[in-house]
């Protein structure tokens, strides 16, 4: 007989998720309306394409990237979709309430959907550190807390530091990474004897994870340029991101081979390292004045990613209980920091070049933004971790970590788990 959700979760999840969905529908009913002023339909189509790219990145890219576990690939893809769908709805409302609410109504535009998709992407990055150890009811909590924390962080940064949409959204890499790592730190860590094989990767899921990485690789320029407000900035962002991810692929594959005693290439290294350039270049993609600089960044990011993938999993597994193949968290934390540092360096160069003698002030502002992003990520991540540990959510037992059969109906399987 195929396995079932524990009875308690069968009661808890549908009730919790459907009640939440009903509440969201009511909020949309009372507080939102569409932007009715679209004079230019051609512009609408072009604008929609960017949003579509972001949705592909989220649903297919990150969905499949996290699906490399031998016995947890179904859950990875479907739970990602579930979180994306829920996250986008809540992010649209939250962004609207934070930025437009004095007017009484939240106007929904393609841009607000774009922003919401990017906010939801944050959860999909973070969740890599905890997938397989939590159920859907817990993931709902994680979505709500993280989207709320990111929305508030972005609002605070834009108000205090006068930062534009692109800059305050590019903190997403660092924010998502530290949020995910701090949630993972709070969850039960040790894997009981006999279940270690479940968090290992298998060939077919690894292939689908590579497919996810390819989708992310293709659409990363769209992500980095989506919130820029002029065509020339967007063009720069697209070009620089493309050069950076191109170089990071070459570096990832070569570096992975170099890091192995027999010169073999690790799938896990490649999955994440191919994206390294896109993350590292994100914050300053519109500012980098020439291709060679973006390419150097891609090279450095690729090397850091491969180095991190080689030496950090041991530490992360011991301290945070994150499996070897879930390297997005520490990868993004390192590369996000690299990206922020590059931005500060460019800021200093600009300040020196303009001769206005305000270097300290400029650097202080940027460090303030980054510190705030990390602090809020850690605090909200710890809060989420503590919430997820509550008995009410009926978390999977450690023996049932990384197992699709706990959550899915497999009619062809005769043996339950």
């Amino acid at each position: 007989m195929s396995s079932k959700y524990p009875r308690s979760v069968r009661r808890c999840l549908p009730l919790w998720a459907l009640t939440l969905e009903a509440a969201l529908i009511l909020l949309f009913y009372f507080f939102t309306h569409y932007d009715a002023s679209l004079e230019d339909q051609k512009g609408l189509v072009a604008s929609y394409q960017v949003g579509q790219d972001l949705t592909v990145m989220a649903a297919i890219g990150l969905g499949f990237l996290t699906s490399s576990f031998r016995r947890h690939s179904w859950s990875s893809v479907a739970f990602n979709l579930f979180m994306l769908a829920l996250g986008v709805q809540w992010a649209i409302l939250l962004d609207g309430f934070l930025s437009q609410f004095p007017s009484g109504k939240v106007v929904i535009t393609l841009f607000s959907i774009r922003l919401a998709t990017m906010s939801a992407l944050s959860v999909l990055i973070s969740v890599d550190a905890v997938l397989g150890k939590v159920n859907l009811a817990q993931l709902v909590v994680m979505v709500l807390v993280e989207v709320t924390a990111l929305g508030n962080l972005r609002m605070v940064i834009s108000n205090i530091f006068n930062t534009d949409y692109h800059m305050n959204m590019m903190h997403i890499y660092v924010f998502a990474a530290y949020f995910g790592l701090s949630v993972a730190w709070c969850l039960p860590k040790p894997l009981p004897e006999g279940t270690e094989d479940k968090d290992q990767t298998a060939t077919i899921p690894s292939l689908s994870a590579m497919l996810g990485a390819l989708f992310l690789w293709m659409f990363w320029p769209s992500f980095n340029s989506a919130l820029l407000r002029s065509p020339i900035e967007r063009k720069n962002a697209v070009f620089n991101t493309y050069y950076a991810v191109a170089v990071s692929v070459v570096t990832a594959i070569s570096g992975s081979s170099l890091a192995h005693p027999q010169g073999k290439i690790s799938k896990t290294y490649v999955h994440s390292a191919v994206l390294a350039g896109g993350v590292a270049v994100g914050t300053s993609c519109h500012l980098i004045p020439s291709p060679w600089l973006a390419m150097v960044l891609g090279l450095v990011a690729g090397l850091i990613s491969v180095g991190g993938a080689k030496y950090l999993p041991g530490c992360c597994n011991r301290v945070l209980g994150i499996p070897h193949s879930s390297i997005m968290g520490y990868n993004f934390s390192l590369l996000g920091l690299l990206g922020e540092i590059i931005y500060i360096v460019l800021l200093v160069l600009d300040t020196v070049g303009a001769g206005n003698g305000m270097i300290g002030f400029q650097v202080l502002l940027s460090i303030g933004e980054l510190s705030l992003a990390i602090v809020i990520a850690l605090m909200s991540g710890l809060l989420t971790g503590l919430l997820l540990n509550l008995k009410i959510w009926k978390a999977p037992h450690e023996a049932k970590y990384f197992d699709d059969q706990v959550f899915w109906k497999f009619p062809h399987l005769a043996v339950g788990f």
Epitope: D35, L38, E39, D40, G43, L44, A46, S47, V50, T109, L110, F111, R114, S158, N159, I160, F161, N162, T163, D164, Y165, M167, R229, S230, P231, I232, E233, H286, L287, P289, L346, L347, L349, D350, V352, G353, A354, N356, M358, F361, Q362, L365
Partner: antibody
Framework: EVQLLESGGGVVQPGRSLRLSCAAS????????MHWVRQAPGKGLEWVAV????????EYADSVKGRFTVSRDNSKNTLYLQMNSLRAEDTAVYYC??????????????????WGQGTLVTVSS | AELTQSPSFLSASVGDRVTITCRAS??????LAWYQQKPGKAPKLLIY???TLQSGVPSRFSGSGSGTEFTLTIASLQPDDFATYYC??????????FGPGTKVDIK
């Protein structure tokens, strides 16, 4: 030569609506962000709204949020400002302005480099 | 960021060196522009990025500052320069606030 020409102003009663237009020529309209700025009689300049080059995002001053809507038709090279629920304090000359993005040493800067001649909106009973 | 300008009114003679100050309530890096406006006319851009002269503007106009304090200097006031001057923050996030203006009058 870059030209911005506002129209649609006039006298209107409180609570009524008015739609302003700004016809652009002499540049590639679809690659520039556009703004509305107003100036009440004898007062300073007040920024009202912005619409991004592709129309994907619009932002407003708190004083007009929920009442004014900015839009553009890139095929007609025209910018619009739909003003609903007008109040006496909305009486002003309304200017449209082009936002140009320029490169500094590394960072990008913005400037309102071209302005229309303005159109007067009077809200009075 | 709120902008304040000082002085709000200034009397000067032709040939004088005139300095107008604009202060921002928050740091706005170098994202500040200066405009000149004459009665019944649209504003005219003089300076952007705090210190860059707009093409076609006479070199007697100059701007400086960064962060929270900015100045517009007219090296030698000409008859055509009697007008109202506004600073504007063009930082990345709306609203793109204008200062209250400084009226330069003939002494």
């Amino acid at each position: 030569e870059v030209q911005l020409l506002e129209s649609g102003g006039g006298v209107v009663q409180p609570g009524r609506s008015l739609r302003l237009s700004c016809a652009a020529s002499g540049f590639t309209f679809s690659t520039y962000g556009m703004h509305w700025v107003r100036q009440a009689p004898g007062k300073g300049l007040e920024w009202v709204a912005v619409i991004w080059f592709d129309g994907s995002n619009k932002e407003y001053a708190d004083s007009v949020k929920g009442r004014f809507t900015v839009s553009r038709d890139n095929s007609k090279n025209t910018l619009y400002l739909q003003m609903n629920s007008l109040r006496a304090e909305d009486t002003a000359v309304y200017y449209c302005a082009r936002e140009e993005v320029v490169r500094g040493v590394i960072l990008w800067s913005r400037k309102f480099d071209y302005w229309g001649q303005g159109t007067l909106v009077t809200v009075s009973s | 960021a709120e902008l304040t300008q000082s002085p709000s009114f200034l009397s000067a003679s032709v040939g004088d060196r005139v300095t107008i100050t604009c202060r921002a309530s928050q740091g706005i890096r170098s994202y500040l522009a200066w405009y000149q406006q004459k009665p019944g006319k649209a504003p005219k851009l003089l300076i952007y990025a705090a210190s860059t002269l707009q093409s076609g503007v006479p070199s007697r106009f100059s701007g400086s500052g960064s962060g929270t304090e900015f100045t517009l200097t007219i090296a030698s006031l000409q008859p055509d320069d009697f007008a109202t001057y506004y600073c504007q923050q063009l930082n990345n996030y709306p609203p793109f606030t204008f200062g209250p203006g400084t009226k330069v009058d003939i002494k």
